[in-house]
Interface confidence: low
């Protein structure tokens, strides 16, 4: 369905208001460091250029491709040189070289100012002397920040958000009613963002074939009562949306998304039972709750998988003939009936299958070969349910705080060349698996558990891909996308690494740590343990918590004593030489 | 994305006879191996025929041996399914699958031998 002016086509499309707030967040994507002013400059000439081609889509330029469009907007910025360097290069570039050049300058850890949350007063006031600025506001910094954030999401929080604010300013309670809502806000926020950068990573590293055996897993998990026919077409039109959003492409990537819940709605009925809530939502929550939807049951009469994929003779026969659909559908049937296994453990299962058909296709007798193929499955199923078993106990043991401790040391001790702030982040949120999976009953764990952890290992593959530091790190997030965790998990301690050398500063505190939250506070120490085992990583678990112990301790201590700042100065110097001591420093 | 549409089933009296067609879509249907499969009310999947990507090569299952023939036109993408000498036996839903699988990728056509 060509379009005259593909501008005015999703203008028309989208509304002037998702239109705005979308590219509102493509351009704060793309030029992470312009101030917000230069940007809503920015997204009202194009929004008003888009409208003269609604009223006239052979008006000039209205022709031109959004990205032609949008490149050209974005390289009228006067400091683009200043600010941005040699991304400013991308500029001398034709499309689709520019929007390729702009894409591969996205930063995943900009150096921006951690966003600080005004009072309550504050933000009410600002709220309502100008909510549409208010709004884009919180649209800007979450984009900027988020460079990958799944755009038509984005507006599905910013409806919530505003929402908030609508009901709690006017309640008598404001903090009461915000702060929760705002705290719910930016935690789903921050997991929503690691989420689709799993996606953009998974697609831009590994391929469209990668992502697309990703969503045929889980759509397939998602749907069991959906044919394998309908399960392709989702896989198909998903892989479109986030192939879009993942390459800058907003509005496109929005529309198609609203397409795909307007088919999956419409088409309920051979798809899954449990979609009726979602669909009687509107748009932005039926998308959201669609996504998030509870797996459907599973049809009772599935015959045997062996009866197709090992028994048949014809094995080989149908997999030399259609290859990917062959394996699509083993990854389609074991997936359906396998909703108590992570995604990344069924895409394991499948690669192994495909290399055994590889192999004994080609052998003297290829049903001899394969006839066992499922025994190699057993391996690679008990060591994440093994894993899994042993780290939820651990947390059960330790808490969340003391289960981050000591995963804090286990990467560390791996990876020890890795920024201490990126251990801190990776490790906090490998963490919190315990308190996210292991309440969960085991049929529920490990598709919980691993593929949280796959989101998370990828936060680390790409801030360490920014500044590469460590070879391991390296191998283990390039050679294989669904061998991540367990190519992590197989590290042992790093034997090739120099410690560190000892630097007083590093262990040197402030009053100012008794005005910080509990969170924060929690980070600090972190800090001060992970640059521990770096200038000690051989010393043992006690060694390490005792050490800890006794900087608790100081830390109580010196915030409540009456000379904050003194107490702190002397009882650091103890305790720095204590540690010292203690660890053979 | 790959799509399977069947049709040709219908009411039809024992002895009678019927020409099931898919018609497929998204994926390079020359390329590919193409089977019958049916599920009888109450019953699991059951194997009917199978085709190679040329045509050359046709199986049948032994309770329609002789009287169902297979075949393909790879210019319209589509397969075929001839059926001969019916049988109340025979009534099921048949649907068209890639390669050997039993797994319905499609909605299939009512097939009902009755008197």
């Known amino acids: 369905d060509a379009h005259k002016s593909e501008v005015a086509h999703r203008f028309k499309d989208l509304g002037e208001e998702n239109f705005k707030a979308l590219v509102l967040i493509a351009f704060a994507q793309y030029l992470q460091q312009c101030p917000f002013e230069d940007h809503v400059k920015l997204v009202n000439e194009v929004t008003e250029f888009a409208k003269t081609c609604v009223a006239d889509e052979s008006a000039e330029n209205c022709d031109k491709s959004l990205h032609t469009l949008f490149g050209d907007k974005l390289c009228t910025v006067a400091t683009l040189r200043e600010t941005y360097g040699e991304m400013a290069d991308c500029c001398a570039k034709q499309e689709p070289e520019r929007n390729e050049c702009f894409l591969q300058h996205k930063d995943d850890n900009p150096n921006l100012p951690r966003l600080v949350r005004p009072e309550v007063d504050v933000m009410c006031t600002a709220f309502h002397d100008n909510e549409e600025t208010f709004l884009k506001k919180y649209l800007y910094e979450i984009a900027r920040r988020h460079p990958y954030f799944y755009a038509p999401e984005l507006l599905f929080f910013a409806k919530r958000y505003k929402a908030a604010f609508t009901e709690c300013c006017q309640a008598a309670d404001k903090a009461a009613c915000l702060l929760p809502k705002l705290d719910e806000l930016r935690d789903e926020g921050k997991a929503s963002s690691a989420k689709q950068r799993l996606k953009c990573a998974s697609l831009q590293k590994f391929g469209e074939r990668a992502f697309k055996a990703w969503a045929v897993a889980r759509l397939s998990q998602r749907f069991p009562k959906a044919e394998f026919a309908e399960v392709s077409k989702l896989v198909t039109d998903l892989t479109k949306v986030h192939t879009e959003c993942c390459h800058g492409d907003l509005l496109e990537c929005a529309d198609d998304r609203a397409d795909l819940a307007k088919y999956i709605c419409e088409n309920q009925d051979s798809i899954s039972s449990k979609l009726k809530e979602c669909c009687e939502k509107p748009l932005l929550e039926k998308s959201h709750c669609i996504a998030e939807v509870e797996n459907d049951e599973m049809p009772a009469d599935l015959p045997s998988l062996a009866a197709d994929f090992v028994e048949s003779k014809d094995v080989c026969k149908n997999y030399a003939e259609a290859k990917d659909v062959f394996l699509g559908m083993f990854l389609y049937e074991y997936a359906r009936r396998h909703p108590d296994y992570s995604v990344v453990l069924l895409l394991r299962l499948a690669k192994t299958y495909e290399t055994t058909l590889e192999k004994c296709c080609a052998a003297a007798d290829p049903h001899e070969c394969y006839a066992k193929v499922f025994d190699e499955f057993k391996p690679l199923v008990e060591e994440p349910q093994n894993l899994i078993k042993q780290n939820c106990e651990l947390f059960e043991q330790l808490g969340e705080y003391k289960f981050q401790n000591a995963l804090l040391v286990r990467y560390t001790k791996k990876v020890p060349q890795v920024s201490t702030p990126t251990l801190v982040e990776v490790s906090r949120n490998l963490g919190k698996v315990g308190s996210k999976c292991c309440k969960h009953p085991e049929a529920k764990r490990m598709p919980c558990a691993e593929d949280y952890l796959s989101v998370v290992l990828n936060q680390l593959c790409v801030l360490h891909e920014k500044t590469p530091v460590s070879d391991r790190v390296t191998k283990c997030c390039t050679e294989s996308l669904v061998n991540r965790r367990p190519c992590f998990s197989a590290l042992e301690v790093d034997e090739t690494y120099v410690p560190k050398e000892f630097n007083a500063e590093t262990f040197t505190f402030h009053a100012d740590i008794c005005t910080l939250s509990e969170k924060e506070r929690q980070i600090k120490k972190q800090t001060a343990l992970v640059e521990l085992v770096k200038h000690k990583p051989k010393a043992t678990k006690e060694q390490l918590k005792a050490v800890m112990d006794d900087f608790a301790a100081f830390v109580e201590k010196c915030c409540k004593a009456d000379d904050k700042e003194t107490c702190f100065a002397e009882e650091g110097k103890k305790l720095v030489a204590a540690s010292q001591a203690a660890l053979g420093l | 994305q790959v799509q399977l549409v069947e049709s040709g089933g219908g009411l039809v009296q024992p002895g009678g006879s019927l020409r099931l067609s898919c018609a497929a879509s998204?994926?390079?249907?020359?390329?590919?191996?193409m089977s019958w499969v049916r599920q009888a009310p109450g019953k699991g999947p059951e194997w009917v025929s199978a085709?190679?990507?040329?045509?050359?090569?046709?199986r049948y299952a032994e309770t329609v041996k002789g009287r169902f023939t297979i075949s393909r036109d790879n210019a319209k993408k589509t397969l075929y399914l001839q059926m001969n000498s019916l049988k109340p036996e025979d009534t099921a839903v048949y649907y068209c699958?890639?390669?050997?699988?039993?797994?319905?990728g499609s909605q299939g056509t009512q097939v009902t031998v009755s008197s």
């Open positions: 998204g994926f390079s249907f020359g390329s590919f191996g």
């Open positions: 085709i190679d990507s040329g045509g050359a090569d046709t």
């Open positions: 699958t890639i390669g050997r699988s039993t797994t319905r």
